[in-house]
Structures are given as C-alpha cells and as structure tokens.
Interface confidence: medium
C-alpha cells in the first residue's frame, strides 16, 4: 500500500502556535487516540472529492490518474499538518461516489487529537479547492482501533 512520510517530525510543545486558521483543542495539544508502543497515533480519514469522477484507473496504482491524485492528496496533507508531529499517511483507497478517499494518518504520540485532525482538515478545504482543484466534502475522522490491519486499514467509521 502506498505510504507518504512527512519530511519533518518535530514535536510541538504545549506552547506552540498553530497557524491562525487552525483552532487547536487546547493550548496543550494532547492525543488520546490508540497508540503503538513506538509512540505513534493513527487516525482514519474519509472524504469525498465531488468534482472528480471515479473510474477503473483509480483501482490501479500504476495509472497516471491514480498517481496524480495520490500525489496531490499527499502534498495537501503535508500542507495541512505542517506543524511538527505529522509522520505521514498510508492505506490510500479510492472508492466510487464521485471519488471517495479513505486513508490513515500517522502522527507522533501527543502532538494532535481527533478533534484537531478534523478541525484542521476542514479549515483547509477552501485552499484545497484553489490550490489542487479538489472540492472536498463529507469529511469524517476517527481514531483507528488498535490493533488494526495495516493491509486492510481501518473500517469505514459508522
């Protein structure tokens, strides 16, 4: 499964300042998501890209359509979570329904929580439309149950 790793992973401390459009949970941004012993928190994220159409190319990682969309999404997440702690994303899946994107985000333990993952992604939707021509809707974020299968990813949250 394709994986994108963030090139930076410096931990945000309790007094760190988020960029102005992003309200964090608190001044000290802690996580209670399921965590591995290596200190990594995982979040399952699903959203619709309503201005794209799903076709069979998105079932084949070797196609240009798949690779371009995966690249844009990976770059977008590096922009959204550019404060320290974002480790990358994995298990990208594309589904029918315009295009439904499902993926898993990884953060260093203690740097973010599920509330802030969703808030920051929602705050970025307008910029995503202009920068990547992706019209995003129906965002859903949840803690990944632990243990989970790295092959299958997390199930679609209820």
């Amino acid at each position: 499964t394709p994986t994108t790793l963030a090139s930076h992973s410096t931990k945000t401390d309790a007094s760190s300042t988020h960029h102005s459009s992003v309200p964090p949970l608190t001044s000290s941004n802690h996580s209670t998501s399921p965590q591995l012993s290596t200190g990594v928190s995982f979040f399952f994220l699903s959203f619709h890209i309503s201005n794209l159409q799903f076709n069979s190319s998105l079932e084949d990682p070797s196609t240009d359509y798949y690779q371009e969309l995966q690249r844009d999404i990976s770059e977008m997440f590096l922009q959204i979570y550019k404060q320290g702690g974002f480790l990358g994303l994995s298990n990208i899946k594309f589904r029918p329904g315009s295009v439904v994107v499902q993926l898993t985000l990884a953060f260093r333990e203690g740097t973010i929580n599920v509330h802030d993952v969703e808030t920051q992604f929602n705050q970025y939707k307008t910029e995503a439309a202009s920068r990547y021509n992706l019209t995003i809707s129906d965002v859903s974020v949840s803690d990944v149950p632990f243990p989970f299968s790295a092959q299958s990813g997390a199930g679609v949250p209820g």
Partner: antibody
Framework: EIQLVQSGAEVKKPGSSVKVSCKVT?????????WHWMRQAPGQGLEWIGY???????SYNPSLKSRATLTRDTSTNTFYMELSSLRSEDTAFYFC???????????????WGQGTLVTVSS | DIQMTQSPSTLSASVGDRVTITCRAS??????IHWYQQKPGKAPKLLIK???ESISGVPSRFSGSGSGTEFTLTISSLQPDDFATYYC?????????FGQGTKVEVK
C-alpha cells in the same frame, strides 16, 4: 444570539433507548464549532459523553462503552444523542453545549442547552 | 483519564465573605481549566476560562489562578446571587473531565 433548545423530559424502561435533540439557532452546526453532550445524575457532577464535530465526525467517552450515538440533521440545524441499553444509573439531566474557540484559538464550552431529564425506571 | 478533585465539597459562607475553591488535577494540565457556576435545575455557566481569563458579562469578583495541577477560583466578596455549585473542567486531554463540584451555601 446563539441558543440551544433541547427536547422534553423522557421516562424510559431499562433496556430501551432514548434520543434527545438539541436545536441550534443563531449559528450553523456545520461551521466552526463542535457540539457536545454532557450528563449529570441527580446530585452528582458532570460527565462528558461525546461530540459531533462541525465536519461531521464524532468522538465518545469510552466509559459509555459504545452505548451512545451522536448524529445531526443539518437541514434543521439539530444534533442528537441516542443512548441504548438504558439502566437506572443513566437517570440524569442531559445537556448539550457548544464547544467554541476564542481569538487565540483555544476551546471551551460557551453556550449550553437547558437540560433534558431522562428517567430510567421499571 | 485526568481526574479533577475539588475541595471543599461544601462551603458555608456569608454575604461579603472571600471564598476560595480549589481544584487539583491528577496530572499536569498547564492552564487548560475552566470554571462554571451551576444553579439548581439550570445549565452550567462559564465563569473563567484557561485558569485565569475573565468572561464577558461575568462580575469581576470572580477570578481564577493556578497552573500545572493546582487551581483556585476566588470570589472576592460573596453576593446573594453567588450561592450555587461550582465546577472545574479540564480540556487538556480527552475525555474531557469535570470536578465533582463545590456547593457554596448560606452559613
């Protein structure tokens, strides 16, 4: 002015479910806040149940062991809390509240509903 | 979960008294604590946010202080309208948790 108006009191049998609503006026539930539920047993303190985010995601207090389900209806600007497998210990006032943020982007509960008494009794 | 312990559970006081309520967190929460006032049959009302920050419309006699694990809410001169139950609440971590409450009653 933002207001949160909750549905009326309920009396339920053990093992059944209850669904409490919270209608929001003066602010869209799809914009910039998350929407939470708390409960308070008679004479007791407050317990956080969970939230539905303005983006639609939900999170719950593990203490409720998946008995709580939070949903919303964006067409009526209303959000809901359903609690299943009711037992007598669930008898409480249930409060909805807006979790908002100030100019320094820090979160707190600034507006609350009036409360809904749910009584579980055989 | 972070436990929030308030003391005392009940406080008897008279109008004009200076009243102090303490809240202790089970771990360091910085200043991520809020104080609420609740009257019987009513919803809680926010008094102080982030340990010491005042809320518009709340009388200046209410103040808060502390950081880390020890916090206080002070009412400088108790008024008849202040007889109520007071709660602290942390939002340093999920799940959000509240203290068990301090009831301020007439002496």
């Amino acid at each position: 002015e933002i207001q949160l108006v909750q549905s009326g009191a309920e009396v339920k049998k053990p093992g059944s479910s209850v669904k409490v609503s919270c209608k929001v006026t003066g602010h869209s539930i799809t914009r910039g806040s998350s929407w939470h539920w708390m409960r308070q047993a008679p004479g007791q303190g407050l317990e956080w149940i969970g939230y539905i985010h303005y983006g639609g995601g939900t999170s719950y207090n593990p203490s409720l062991k998946s008995r709580a389900t939070l949903t919303r209806d964006t067409s009526t600007n209303t959000f809901y809390m359903e609690l299943s497998s009711l037992r007598s210990e669930d008898t409480a006032f249930y409060f909805c509240a807006r979790y908002s943020y100030d100019i320094t982007y820090r979160w707190f509960f600034d507006v609350w509903g009036q409360g809904t008494l749910v009584t579980v009794s055989s | 979960d972070i436990q929030m312990t308030q003391s005392p559970s009940t406080l008897s006081a008279s109008v004009g008294d200076r009243v102090t309520i303490t809240c202790r967190a089970s771990q360091n929460i910085g200043t991520s604590i809020h104080w609420y006032q609740q009257k019987p049959g009513k919803a809680p009302k926010l008094l102080i946010k982030y340990a010491s920050e005042s809320i518009s419309g709340v009388p200046s006699r209410f103040s808060g202080s502390g950081s880390g694990t020890e916090f206080t809410l002070t009412i400088s001169s108790l008024q008849p309208d202040d007889f109520a139950t007071y709660y602290c609440q942390q939002n340093n971590n999920w799940p959000l948790t509240f203290g068990q409450g301090t009831k301020v009653e007439v002496k």
